[in-house]
Amino acid sequence: QPSVSPGEPSPPSIHPAKSELIVRVGNEIRLLCIDPGFVKWTFEILDETNENKQNEWITEKAEATNTGKYTCTNKHGLSSSIYVFVRDPAKLFLVDRSLYGKEDNDTLVRCPLTDPEVTSYSLKGCQGKPLPKDLRFVPDPKAGITIKSVKRAYHRLCLHCSADQEGKSVLSDKFILKVRPAFKAVPVVSVSKASYLLREGEEFTVTCTIKDVSSSVYSTWKRENSQTKLQEKYNSWHHGDFNYERQATLTISSARVNDSGVFMCYANNTFGSANVTTTLEVVDKGFINIFPMINTTVFVNDGENVDLIVEYEAFPKPEHQQWIYMNRTFTDKWEDYPKSENESNIRYVSELHLTRLKGTEGGTYTFLVSNSDVNASIAFNVYVNTKPEILTYDRLVNGMLQCVAAGFPEPTIDWYFCPGTEQRCSASVLPVDVQTLNASGPPFGKLVVQSSIDSSAFKHNGTVECKAYNDVGKTSAYFNFAFKGNNKEQIHPHTLFTP
């Protein structure tokens, strides 16, 4: 007899040969799987799965919980299924009350029916409350009711599956929907301080705050240009439903100079990433750097005001500041303040206010500042510009007329002869001798100049003018003399101020 070549393997047959079967509660379920290569029966409902290696599945007294899909599988991996409803008027719904939905995705409210012939299978709000207007759902008696495109606003929504059984509305146990938000923006990251300055051995601690809609945001501290895993500690809070905050604190208990660098707090979610950086500078010891805000050599006119201003960087923070002049410390007339209120600030300003300076108040003004590690100072050389003052004007025994003037800058002395009684002297007279008397004396204050002319050069009655001047102003002194015969009888010196 010719051999028959076997065809393609076929799926098993099930008796009764139906896709669905309705059994009353308490009655028997008897399912037969017909296949020469029978392997097993599998029962599935909600998250429950049972297996049976017998080719006949028998449940003597059916319960509502026996409602579900029965699948017979053969050795070829082919299968056939039948769905059995166990109708129980006291238990219309099978429920798995866990209900999670991802925002913008569909989610299944698992409340399959035990009776496919009920009507108005739908969702209802708890306590009769209306469901959200935009909530759409699709019922499936074998699986439950699918909520379409879950919204964030549905979080904590209380609902029931509902169906009309013999003209009466029946509700399932209640479900509370928990919505997992979708990431629709990158995380928000911020850092406690943008920069840190420490001395060796001090503790470095910096906190990154990460804000997002859920705790599944990822975050880490990274060292730029380094793969080393950093030690960090976390604290986190939920401020309401979709407002999560995490604080990631990075600590280096004893910072070293080579720990200096840029540290990045990085966070990402499925939408994207964000980062923020902080800079650490570790120095072996503290420092002070002073920057004058005006020239350290200052020229000021007599009677005017001047402000000596410095900015300085000090780390650690300054402990002592003072302004000194002629070994005397100013107790007032100065102020010292931080350049900014930022807690990272290391820059400060100090101002000394000198008012109505006198010619005698020129000199070196010194600002001194110190912290726990170093001292620093800066000096200002203050020159007070003064109008010349004629100190002496005499006729010497040797016939010389001598004028001595003091002022700053160094005065120039010019001589003029005025014939007769005029006091407008135009004819200049060259001095015989000019000396700066205190050029080698103290570096500040007035400079004294002495100038002499020979009076024997004058043959007529008249007045001699000694005029001392500099950039600030001028002052004159006059010598009146007359001839009696061939003798110069008298010389009356007097001054005339010329502004």
Partner: antibody, heavy 116, light 108 residues
Framework: QIQLVQSGPELKKPGESVKISCKAS????????IHWVKQAPGQGLRWMAW????????TYADDFKGRFVFSLEASASTAHLQISNLKNEDTATFFC?????????WGQGTLVTVSS | SYELIQPPSASVTLENTVSITCSGD??????AHWYQQKPDKTILEVIY???ERPSGISDRFSGSSSGTTAILTIRDAQAEDEADYYC???????????FGGGTKLTVL
């Protein structure tokens, strides 16, 4: 069928208290909230409060906090509204309502008259 | 405070169609429900969830919603439709109910 049946009319003096009731039948009492609604003579409907029949927790409208107590007697499928220190302006018909969509079914109303 | 605005009165000749409006800022995302109060004070729900009709309510009653306005339409108006009609919706995250001011419908 679902029914909400309210207690009868009340005549009270200012300063007194009144307690009116709303008995539900035809459904599982704890499935649906009970709402209370006030209608003053010649006026429209004003929602006062709803009470969660599962937990007993009331949720009030701002104007009905203080003198108004909303309570349940779940074993008797009954909700109560008590008003203390009655005022002339409390004269009104009070309705209870409930059902599968909040105000699906209404009681017949209870007239409370406050008069000295 | 939140309000639902209804016209105080409306009229319709017998067997004609009338529409009553209810306006409120939240109505684009909250359902409107409609209630009929007869002269004897009895109250009946005629429309829920914008457009659903409870069993036992005549199909002459219909509801719709567009933007911030909900509409109750009564076609083929009958003498027994003469009543006050109230819309109701909810407001705030707590879904607190609020009624419109009511519309007195006269059937001529």
């Amino acid at each position: 069928q679902i029914q909400l049946v309210q207690s009868g009319p009340e005549l009270k003096k200012p300063g007194e208290s009144v307690k009116i009731s709303c008995k539900a039948s035809g459904y599982t009492f704890t499935d649906y909230a009970i709402h209370w609604v006030k209608q003053a003579p010649g006026q429209g409907l004003r929602w006062m409060a709803w009470i969660n029949t599962e937990t007993g927790k009331p949720t009030y409208a701002d104007d009905f906090k203080g003198r108004f107590v909303f309570s349940l007697e779940a074993s008797a499928s009954t909700a109560h509204l008590q008003i203390s220190n009655l005022k002339n302006e409390d004269t009104a018909t009070f309705f209870c309502a409930g059902g599968s969509h909040w105000f699906a079914y209404w009681g017949q109303g209870t007239l409370v008259t406050v008069s000295s | 405070s939140y309000e639902l605005i209804q016209p105080p009165s409306a009229s319709v000749t017998l067997e004609n169609t009338v529409s009553i409006t209810c306006s409120g800022d939240e109505l684009s995302n909250k359902y409107a429900h409609w209630y009929q109060q007869k002269p004897d004070k009895t109250i009946l729900e005629v429309i829920y969830n914008d457009s659903e009709r409870p069993s036992g309510i005549s199909d002459r009653f219909s509801g719709s919603s567009s933007g911030t306005t909900a509409i109750l339409t009564i076609r083929d108006a009958q003498a027994e439709d003469e009543a006050d009609y109230y819309c109701l919706s909810t407001f705030s995250d707590d879904d607190l109910p609020i009624f419109g001011g009511g519309t007195k419908l006269t059937v001529l």
